[in-house]
């Protein structure tokens, strides 16, 4: 039905093409493994069209199946560093509402300094996605090395 | 508005679904770190629907947000080779027009022989994407190991 | 033309937005390198909207260009394990019909325990995709570590 309305020239938002690409703002305080994200036209090539940021975490505004993708690069890192400080792990999941909490995507760095992956997953309005980086190494904030995004694919 | 015209049965191109998937043609001459790509029906499973190739580099024909993805595998490579020849780095960026030059995506191989990633980024008509591979190792030209593509996602 | 029909309020399936995200069910018997997948609402966050499973392999129902993505994580794995058991390789390809058999995507684990990649590729109705994992290490069945999916992008 959403697509049936195309003839009425409704704005793209009504077509359901929510999309966001975020850059790293900062890491969390003590005992908080979350990465905090930022996005918007004043911040280079990051943007939010539909989803919103809630205290640095991405909140979904439209039900549907989404492509979620992420790349995280560790700063001042070599394969020796990465293996010496193993395990360093990144997990992307729904962290709220608590009733829907689940890990969607998980990767370890092993002897590498970058992880990158993507997956399709159903998300609902109000779902907040968190990206947890556990370990002793800090991520790069360079916008071409660390980024996180979602793309609405279909209802 | 583009979608509002769907009822007029315009060709898909007018809907803005530009997409391309390229295979490696060759590497650049001395001092040129760029990879040169090729695509088209005569070349197996690569294709260009909208974007064009300009001297082996991908040129965008439609403004919008794109999903850019790449995989590069180093030829005759083992983890020992990769670490011995470290750093080998791949960067994808807008290389022209010069005023819009920026790195979009960067990865190092460390002890691995393949990198793969993807990201959402705004691109404008006329933007040319370059993929720079720096280091002493050469990429595989196997079409299932090394490829580069873009997909228009929304205006 | 498919999009021109939007005004008739046809179901999404007629718009061609076929999509699937699968989780690992089991590995094949001796001499069968294939991974066997499962998906559906009863299985957490996996789903099939359009494509079907045929004995654990993904069969395409609609011609078009697809984004194919995969992540496979090896179970009980460290970088030492991965390098000691090298080569462990994952290949995604069309395995039937035999006349269209081709490898689409190939990655080796080297010193890592996870591979993840994605690519655009034309697929035709009836194409069956197989994911072959060769080597002595077994994949994790955790749904956030090993998954495989496709998304219809355009005709």
């Amino acid at each position: 039905q959403r697509f049936a309305q195309a003839q009425q020239q409704l704005p793209l938002e009504s077509l359901g093409w929510d999309v966001a690409e975020l850059q790293l703002n900062h890491t969390g305080p003590q005992q908080d493994p979350r990465l905090y994200w930022q996005g918007g036209p004043a911040l280079g090539r990051s943007f939010l069209h539909g989803p919103e940021l809630d205290k640095g975490q991405l909140r979904i505004h439209r039900d549907g199946i989404y492509m979620v993708h992420i790349q995280v690069t560790l700063a001042i890192c070599s394969s020796t560093t990465a293996s010496r400080h193993h395990p360093t792990t990144l997990a992307v999941g729904i962290c709220s509402p608590a009733s829907r909490s689940i890990s969607l995507l998980r990767l370890s760095f092993h002897q590498g300094c970058t992880i990158a992956s993507q997956r399709l997953t159903p998300l609902a309005r109000g779902d907040t996605l968190c990206t947890n980086l556990t370990g002793t190494l800090l991520p790069s904030r360079n916008t071409d090395e660390t980024f996180f995004g979602v793309q609405w694919v279909r209802p | 508005q583009r979608f509002a015209q769907a009822q007029q049965q315009l060709p898909l191109e007018s809907l803005g679904w530009d997409v391309a998937e390229l295979q490696l043609n060759h590497t650049g001459p001395q001092q040129d770190p760029r990879l040169y790509w090729q695509g088209g029906p005569a070349l197996g499973r690569s294709f260009l629907h909208g974007p064009e190739l300009d001297k082996g580099q991908l040129r965008i024909h439609r403004d919008g947000i794109y999903m850019v993805h790449i995989q590069v595998t180093l030829a005759i490579c083992s983890s020992t080779t990769a670490s011995r020849h470290h750093p080998t780095t791949l960067a994808v960026g807008i290389c022209s027009p010069a005023s819009r030059s920026i790195s979009l995506l960067r990865l190092s191989f460390h002890q691995g022989c393949t990198i793969a990633s993807q990201r959402l980024t705004p691109l404008a008509r006329g933007d040319t994407l370059c993929t720079n591979l720096t280091g002493t190792l050469l990429p595989s030209r196997n079409t299932d190991e090394t490829f580069f593509g873009v997909q228009w996602v929304r205006p | 033309q498919r999009f021109a029909q939007a005004q008739q309020q046809l179901p999404l399936e007629s718009l061609g937005w076929d999509v699937a995200e699968l989780q690992l069910n089991h590995t094949g018997p001796q001499q069968d390198p294939r991974l066997y997948w499962q998906g559906g609402p009863a299985l957490g966050r996996s789903f099939l909207h359009g494509p079907e499973l045929d004995k654990g392999q993904l069969r395409i129902h609609r011609d078009g260009i697809y984004m194919v993505h995969i992540q496979v994580t090896l179970a009980i794995c460290s970088s030492t394990t991965a390098s000691r058991h090298h080569p462990t390789t994952l290949a995604v390809g069309i395995c039937s019909p035999a006349s269209r058999s081709i490898s689409l995507l190939r990655l080796s684990f080297h010193q890592g325990c996870t591979i993840a990649s994605q690519r655009l590729t034309p697929l035709a109705r009836g194409d069956t995709l197989c994911t072959n994992l060769t080597g002595t290490l077994l994949p994790s069945r955790n749904t956030d570590e090993t998954f495989f999916g496709v998304q219809w992008v355009r005709p």
Partner: antibody
Framework: QVQLVQSGAEVKKPGASVKVSCKAS????????MHWVRQAPGQGLEWMGW????????SYAQQFQGRVTMTRDTSMSTVYMELTRLRADDTAVYYC????????????WGQGTLVTVSS | DIQMTQSPSSLSASVGDRVTITCQAS??????LNWYQQKPGKVPNLLIY???NLETGVPSRFSGSGSGTDFTFTISSLQPEDIATYYC?????????FGQGTRLEIK
């Protein structure tokens, strides 16, 4: 504003140990690596290692491995660098520094602590 | 470890001169290179980060360029207050390493 305040100068005998402190203020202490860099009299800069104040994890330069220990007290927003088995060529000014790297903007240094090793 | 070789180790120039210092890395370090100024008895001060970006508050007569293994630091018009030692520093790979320094004095 960001400030890194180090402990005062020390005079030590060869074979002894020294522990230098660095108190941080004006920023999120656990959000950045704290580095230690030393400079011998009339010489260049030499990186010793970093500590992640959030996790306590460390990375040391090879030449200091086994002799240096970096620790932190998050309640005091303070990091410590202890160097053992001191030699005459360890005589240097020791700096704690929140160095710029990989988009983590702001480059701040403590005032330096002169450690003199002499018999 | 990555060796950073600076040249020259010292140089003398006149006020208003264009001054160039080079830094060569023993292996490719992308653009992960910073330039510091250290005046006698003072702490180092970051001038240029990531090879070519001017740190906030630093005069525009300072600039940097290069990528990979070869980098250049330039003062377009030398001022008396620029008398200092200049260091390049890489952070691509641990350990972080500094060049040996270039001592700059006025003729």
């Amino acid at each position: 504003q960001v400030q890194l305040v180090q402990s005062g100068a020390e005079v030590k005998k060869p074979g002894a140990s020294v522990k230098v402190s660095c108190k941080a203020s004006g920023y999120s202490f656990t959000g950045y690596y704290m580095h230690w860099v030393r400079q011998a009299p009339g010489q260049g800069l030499e990186w010793m290692g970093w500590i992640n104040p959030k996790s306590g994890g460390t990375s040391y330069a090879q030449q200091f491995q086994g002799r240096v220990t970096m620790t932190r007290d998050t309640s005091m927003s303070t990091v410590y660098m202890e160097l053992t088995r001191l030699r005459a060529d360890d005589t240097a000014v020791y700096y704690c520094a929140r160095l710029y790297y990989s988009g983590w903007y702001g480059d701040y240094w403590g005032q330096g602590t002169l450690v003199t090793v002499s018999s | 470890d990555i060796q950073m070789t600076q040249s020259p180790s010292s140089l003398s120039a006149s006020v208003g001169d264009r001054v160039t210092i080079t830094c060569q890395a023993s292996q490719d370090i992308n653009n992960y290179l910073n330039w510091y100024q250290q005046k006698p008895g003072k702490v180092p001060n970051l001038l240029i980060y990531d090879a070519s970006n001017l740190e906030t508050g630093v005069p525009s007569r300072f600039s940097g360029s290069g990528s990979g293994t070869d980098f250049t630091f330039t003062i377009s018009s030398l001022q008396p207050e620029d008398i200092a030692t200049y260091y390049c520093q890489q952070y691509n790979n641990p350990p972080i390493t500094f060049g040996q320094g270039t001592r700059l004095e006025i003729k």
